[in-house]
């Protein structure tokens, strides 16, 4: 599933190339595997921010789907609460690219861990 | 009014295929992902399918997928069940359902076809 | 999967009286960013599921004001605070947090 998550992102970032979008995304560049769950929550919910901007059916359909897979990876600890983490409007803006490469290193962070 | 009409069931053989349509009406069809829920005679009610609005991503329980196969034709506001390799537990009336975005807020089939009856029999 | 068990499986009511149907999932179905995708859905004799309230809580359009959701991580309920007539059928919930998306077994509401 985390490797679909990968291939969803690259998707994403390769319809975005042709768009404007200049939002710029709360994001968690230096993540602590001890708020992994918390982080990977804020890169989603950000998601959300760029499907909705971009008004674009297969980025949304993406962003739906890439939501669908993190979901079931991580129902088993989605609900784990973890203290000490930063909220997701603590984090540092960052625009589109630089949130997509911080998402994919999390990403990679589960797959480690699996 | 948002129309679903799912037509295409009938009497098969186990082990025979069916393709179910559901003709859409009433809404942008294309705006929407759908999905297909079925309920064998006197149970209750199963998740079979979902298909995004572009027809891009689906979803399936374990129960049919590699048999069943979701899809869609945007410009013929038409939603398809494929059913291959079909078994007495198959056996149902099958609804179509149009489904509300995650993103938007929703994620609930808000709209529901009246169904096509699929006997599975030899 | 998600299980979803319902309680009672059959609710018979006198007209006018409240009624209430218990839906407990076997594991939390919050999602990762924070929502709930559990629904409620009427199905009257001899007719297609109808949606009442979706995301726990929220009543769909239509519905009439004596429908309620509530609940919480897994354990949700539907009330209807005077029964009616029209109210005659079963009740699923069904969650779709998690794929497989899951219905309960139904809730046969009957007057008595």
């Known amino acids: 599933n985390w490797v679909n998550v990968i291939s969803d992102l690259k998707k994403i970032e390769d319809l975005i190339q042709s768009m404007h979008i200049d939002a710029t995304l709360y994001t968690e560049s230096d993540v602590h595997p001890s708020c992994k769950v918390t982080a990977m929550k804020c890169f989603l919910l950000e998601l959300q921010v760029i499907s909705l901007e971009s008004g674009d059916a297969s980025i949304h359909d993406t962003v739906e789907n890439l939501i669908i897979l993190a979901n079931n990876s991580l129902s088993s600890n989605g609900n784990v609460t973890e203290s000490g983490c930063k909220e997701c409007e603590e984090l540092e803006e960052k625009n589109i690219k630089e949130f997509l490469q911080s998402f994919v290193h999390i990403v990679q962070m589960f797959i480690n861990t699996s | 009014e948002v129309r679903l009409m799912a037509s295409g069931g009938g009497l098969v053989q186990p082990g025979g295929s069916l393709r179910l349509s559901c003709a859409a009406s009433e809404f942008t069809f294309s705006n929407y992902a759908m999905s297909w829920v079925r309920q064998a005679p006197g149970k209750g009610l199963e998740w079979v399918a979902t298909i995004s609005r572009g027809g891009d991503y689906t979803y399936y329980p374990d129960s049919v997928k590699g048999r069943f196969t979701i899809s869609r034709d945007n410009s013929k506001n038409t939603l398809y069940l494929q059913m291959n390799s079909l078994r007495a537990e198959d056996t149902a009336v099958y609804y179509c359902?149009?489904?509300?975005?995650?993103?938007?807020?929703?994620?609930?089939?808000?709209?529901w076809g009246q169904g096509t009856l699929v006997t599975v029999s030899s | 999967d998600v299980v979803m068990t319902q309680s009672p499986l059959s609710l018979p009511v006198t007209l006018g009286q409240p009624a209430s149907i218990s839906c407990r999932s076997s594991q939390s179905i919050v999602d990762i960013t924070g929502n709930t995708y559990l629904e409620w859905f009427q199905q009257r004799p001899g007719q297609s599921p109808r949606l009442l309230i979706y995301k726990v809580f929220n009543r769909f359009s239509g519905v009439p004001d004596r429908f309620s959701g509530s609940g919480s991580g897994t354990d949700f309920t539907l009330k209807i605070s005077r029964v009616e007539a029209e109210d005659v059928g079963v009740y699923y919930c069904f969650q779709d947090s998690f794929v497989p998306y899951t219905f309960g077994q139904g809730t046969k509401l009957e007057i008595k």
């Open positions: 359902a149009r489904r509300v975005s995650m993103i938007t807020g929703g994620w609930a089939m808000d709209y």
